[in-house]
Structure formats: structure tokens, C-alpha cells
């Protein structure tokens, strides 16, 4: 079972709804526990086919590894099951949920294991560097939403006291190598990067050395970027329809938006014989309006028992905090005979669809 304290469960990738906000979820399990990872669909909408990945490799279901679209179970966990797990959309490979799982030797308990960072005095007069808390050094991948802060730590000891230096992708890493610089605390064996951006992605290595030896640790940083954009709309085909009087018509509009979109179905109307207002803005009437909770919404407008009055231009409009997107749909309503003739003409000409 996972630990329910905030110290243990600290969030997930910015794209994902989860128990704790906006970040990677870090979980600690005891040896022999069942690792259970849950990834509900964003906004409660449809999930679509997913794939579970550990340390970049797709997980193969087995008697011990149970894979479902929203849930992963690893039974009788061992240290080898530690790592970076993610649930991705199979088609786009978009990361829906990201977890850092650590399996410790001891069975899990609710107690916080945080203690002093300093190892007990070993009484050794001289010696090569060593990690003071090696059990804390086993997590290697850090996935962080852009604009947050990252700290890498490599607490070590040795006699004489070792020095620490940092590499990025195998090369010396200094403050001038990134906008915003870096902050080093040698006494805390740490490197801090504020307000990370995608260019900060890479492998970061601490090198700890004295005259008796050298140790190093490499961490991989992934910066999860939400590229904010206005909603993307895709019109369901056919976008333009001809309907018989009294029949039912349905328009489809697919809305993609990372940020919560406000979706509306509108119809162009005339007011006092005019289609536009004094400022040139078209007159519209709102048929449906709601806030979508999901990243991907398939929205429909159903018109029952259509009359000639229902003919005209319809709009699917989606607005988020970045901007607005619209798709136009046309409906022609005719009596039975006229509609049949129009359909024949459309067949001969090839159907015309809006982009």
C-alpha cells in the first residue's frame, strides 16, 4: 500500500489530475508490498488506449505485473521495481501521469524516515569519499513542471573533506550556462536551478572527490512543458449539411485544449434585418454553453425536427485563457423533393466539406 502522508505523495506532472497538484508523484513502498499506481483520465473524460512505461521501456504484463488502462499493479515489489513509471496515451505518447517509485528494504510504515544527513563517525582517520545516505541516492529521474525549482543533492563525507563539482551532460556546469544562473551550496552538497525551462533538460552529475578517491552520481532532469495554446478545433464531417424538413441533424466538433476551455454552440441570426451589429460584430444566439473539464472533448449539437428557420450558419466556439477558436457549420433545410435533388447534385460534384 502507498503511504498516505503528504511527505510521501507529493504530486504529479503538471498535465495530470492527481491526488496532489501539478507535479510528479513520488511514492515509497516497502519490500514485498503491492505497488499500485492509478492514473484516472484527465477531467474524468474518456481515456483512450494507454501504455505503462518504466524507465523509458514499455511494461510487459505478467503474473506479477498487472496492467490496466488506468491502473498498474506490481505484486511482491522488490528493489528492482524502483524507478520512473509513466502512463502515456498510446497514440500520442503524451505523458498522462508520472510516478517516481522507490522500494525500500524495510516494509512500509507511516513514519517519516527523515533524519540527519550526516553519517555516524566511523572513526576512520583517512578515507575516500562516500555517500552519507546511500539509500537516498537511488532515485535518478526527476520530472518537473516548467517554472518550478529543482535541487540536486549529493551529501557525502570523507577525510579529508571532499570537494564537489557539477557536470551537465558530461561537461563542467557553471552559472553562466543557464539563464537565471545556478545556486550552489557546497556545505549542503547541493545544486539549485530556479524556474526551470525545457533547455534545462539533461543529465546532471555530481563529482565528489578527495585525494583518496572520487564518486559520482548522475541524475536525469526532464522538464514537463505545457505549451499553452488556444483551443484546437476539428470539425466532424460533414461540416455542411442539407436536411429534410422535420428530420434530425447533428453537428460534431472536437475540441483540444490543455487549459480548461469554455465551449459554445452559436447560431448566426438577423436582428431587424441585419446580420451584424453597429460595430460589425455578427449577431449570434447562444444555443449551448459550458466549461469542459477534459483535455479532449467531442461536442455535439443536435437539432431535432428541423424547420426552415433552423437553416443557416452555426459556430462551434472554444475559448481558453490564451485565445479563441471557431469552426463554422452550414445547414440547409428543404422540403423532401428539393432536398433529394440537392443530394444528387452534391453526389455528382463530390461532397464539399469545411476545413
Amino acid at each position: 500500500e502507498s503511504l498516505g502522508t503528504e511527505q510521501r505523495v507529493v504530486g504529479r506532472a503538471a498535465e495530470v489530475p492527481g491526488p496532489e497538484p501539478g507535479q510528479q508523484e513520488q511514492l515509497v513502498f516497502g519490500s514485498g508490498d503491492a505497488v499500485e499506481l492509478s492514473c484516472p483520465p484527465p477531467g474524468g473524460g474518456p481515456m483512450g488506449p494507454t501504455v505503462w512505461v518504466k524507465d523509458g521501456t514499455g511494461l510487459v504484463p505478467s503474473e506479477r505485473v498487472l496492467v490496466g488502462p488506468q491502473r498498474l499493479q506490481v505484486l511482491n515489489a522488490s528493489h528492482e521495481d524502483s524507478g520512473a513509471y509513466s502512463c502515456r496515451q498510446r497514440l500520442t505518447q503524451r505523458v498522462l501521469c508520472h510516478f517516481s517509485v522507490r522500494v525500500t528494504d524495510a516494509p512500509s510504515s507511516g513514519d517519516d524516515e527523515d533524519g540527519e544527513d550526516e553519517a555516524e563517525d566511523t572513526g576512520v582517520d583517512t578515507g575516500a569519499p562516500y555517500w552519507t545516505r546511500p539509500e537516498r541516492m537511488d532515485k535518478k529521474l526527476l520530472a518537473v513542471p516548467a517554472a518550478n525549482t529543482v535541487r540536486f543533492r549529493c551529501p557525502a563525507a570523507g577525510n579529508p573533506t571532499p570537494s564537489i563539482s557539477w557536470l551537465k551532460n558530461g561537461r563542467e556546469f557553471r552559472g553562466e550556462h543557464r539563464i537565471g544562473g545556478i545556486k550552489l551550496r557546497h556545505q549542503q552538497w547541493s545544486l539549485v536551478m530556479e524556474s526551470v525551462v525545457p533547455s534545462d533538460r539533461g543529465n546532471y552529475t555530481c563529482v565528489v572527490e578527495n585525494k583518496f578517491g572520487s564518486i559520482r552520481q548522475t541524475y536525469t532532469l526532464d522538464v514537463l512543458e505545457r505549451s499553452p495554446h488556444r483551443p484546437i478545433l476539428q470539425a466532424g464531417l460533414p461540416a455542411n449539411q442539407t436536411a429534410v424538413l422535420g428530420s434530425d441533424v447533428e453537428f460534431h466538433c472536437k475540441v483540444y485544449s490543455d487549459a480548461q476551455p469554455h465551449i459554445q454552440w452559436l447560431k448566426h441570426v438577423e436582428v431587424n434585418g441585419s446580420k451584424v451589429g453597429p460595430d460589425g460584430t455578427p449577431y449570434v444566439t447562444v444555443l449551448k454553453s459550458w466549461i469542459s473539464e477534459s483535455v479532449e472533448a467531442d461536442v455535439r449539437l443536435r437539432l431535432a425536427n428541423v424547420s426552415e428557420r433552423d437553416g443557416g450558419e452555426y459556430l462551434c466556439r472554444a475559448t481558453n485563457f490564451i485565445g479563441v477558436a471557431e469552426k463554422a457549420f452550414w445547414l440547409s433545410v428543404h422540403g423532401p423533393r428539393a432536398a433529394e435533388e440537392e443530394l444528387v447534385e452534391a453526389d455528382e460534384a463530390g461532397s464539399v466539406y469545411a476545413g
Epitope: 504530486g11 515509497v28 513542471p145 529543482v150
Partner: antibody, heavy 127, light 107 residues
């Protein structure tokens, strides 16, 4: 320029409700969190709760859990604090603050830092 | 909840003085400690995070130190704009908790 502007404060009777708004600008709303912190007259600061607008995930102080709800509308870049069943002890200036995480593999928690604050809005609960 | 205790509750000092405020946590909070400054009628401002990291734009006369349970905020040379109330805050545990504040007044 990062800005947070609270609104919606006022006088309300015990047991009543109020909704505070926090309009954010000057930063990517979906990357970081929004925290609410309150300060009773002449007293210190008390953390109320936090939301990450992208996911809608929230955390609350025990003193307000079940009575207060934090939400966000990313289309408006605005976070909200819905306060129900208000009590006299909820009287305070309420601040919203942009909140970011400090991620550190070495420890099993994320440190949350509130780097930009709004000017505050006063909520008075009195009959 | 983790209790944060600041001392002193208030102090009087003169411009140019070196001022030290301490904050003690009821349990180990590693280095997960921030310091904020608040002037009357204004919102708090972040000074220090992670115990010792100066936040962008904060003058270098402010410094923080400590880890575990004992932390210190030092103002090396007090300036007129530094007369204010200072709060420490931890965020390793849920909920985040603040100290009761230290008011720095003009002597």
C-alpha cells in the same frame, strides 16, 4: 509583471458563505500553484490551502477542511476560495499567493514556496 | 502539525545594526524553511527559501542558515525599510505552518 489581485471580501453573518477571487497575470497560470493564506487582525499568518490549477488538485488546512473549497478557472487565470459555514474565527485578511515547488529526489516531499502575494481582501464574520 | 517557534517575539534595533532572528521547529524539517517579511497593511514578501537560498531581488544583507530544527535569519546591516515583522514557515509536513512572527522595531 506578476500580479495577483484578490476580491470578494466583505461582511458576512456566521453560517453564511462568501466566494473570494484571485485574478492572476504575468505568469503561466498552469505551471505553478495558488495558495490561500489568512491573517486574523493583529495575528500571524495561517496557511489555508493550495490548488494547482491545471489538475484542480487541492490541499487544505484541517481548520477549514469540509467548509472551504479552492477551485480555479484556467480560462480566466483566476483561482477561487469558496467559504461556507463561516465562523467568527474565520475573520481575517485573505491573501492568495503564487506557489511553486522545489523538487528534490533526496527527500520524500516537495517544498512549497509562495513567492508573489496579492494585496489581500478582508473577510469579516459577524452578526 | 509541526510547530514553529520564533524568538524573540519582538526586538528594537538601530539602522546599521546586525539583527538575528531564530526559528525552531518541533520536528526535523530538513532545510524546508522559508522566511517572509511583512510591513503593516501589506502582503508578506519572500526573502529566503530552503533555509539559506536568497530569493531573486532580495538584498544580500539578508541571509539564512540552519537545517533540521534550528534556523536563523540574519540582517547584516539593518536599513530603514527593514523595520517589519518576519515570519518563518516550514513545508515538509502537512499543513505548512508559520512561526508566530518577530517584530523588528526602531530603537
Amino acid at each position: 509583471e506578476v500580479q495577483l489581485v484578490e476580491s470578494g471580501g466583505g461582511l458576512v453573518q456566521p453560517g453564511g458563505s462568501l466566494r473570494l477571487s484571485c485574478a492572476a497575470s504575468g505568469f503561466t497560470f498552469t505551471s505553478t500553484g495558488i495558495s490561500w493564506v489568512r491573517q486574523a487582525p493583529g495575528k500571524g499568518l495561517e496557511w489555508v490551502g493550495r490548488i494547482y490549477p491545471t489538475s484542480g488538485s487541492t490541499n487544505y488546512a484541517d481548520s477549514v477542511k469540509g467548509r472551504f473549497t479552492i477551485s480555479a478557472d484556467t480560462s480566466k487565470n483566476t483561482a477561487y476560495l469558496q467559504m461556507n459555514s463561516l465562523r467568527a474565527e474565520d475573520t481575517a485578511v485573505y491573501y492568495c499567493a503564487r506557489t511553486y515547488g522545489i523538487y528534490d529526489l533526496y527527500v520524500d516531499y516537495t517544498e512549497y514556496v509562495m513567492d508573489y502575494w496579492g494585496q489581500g481582501t478582508l473577510v469579516t464574520v459577524s452578526s | 502539525d509541526i510547530q514553529m517557534t520564533q524568538s524573540p517575539s519582538s526586538l528594537s534595533a538601530s539602522v546599521g545594526d546586525r539583527v538575528t532572528i531564530t526559528c525552531r521547529a518541533s520536528q526535523d524539517v530538513d532545510t524546508s524553511l522559508a522566511w517572509y517579511k511583512q510591513k503593516p497593511g501589506k502582503a508578506p514578501k519572500l526573502l529566503i527559501y530552503s533555509a539559506s537560498f536568497l530569493y531573486s531581488g532580495v538584498p544580500s544583507r539578508f541571509s539564512g542558515s540552519g537545517s533540521g530544527t534550528d534556523f536563523t535569519l540574519t540582517i547584516s546591516s539593518l536599513q530603514p525599510e527593514d523595520f517589519a515583522t518576519y515570519y518563518c514557515q516550514q513545508s515538509t509536513g502537512h499543513p505548512q505552518t508559520f512561526g508566530q512572527g518577530t517584530k523588528v522595531e526602531i530603537k
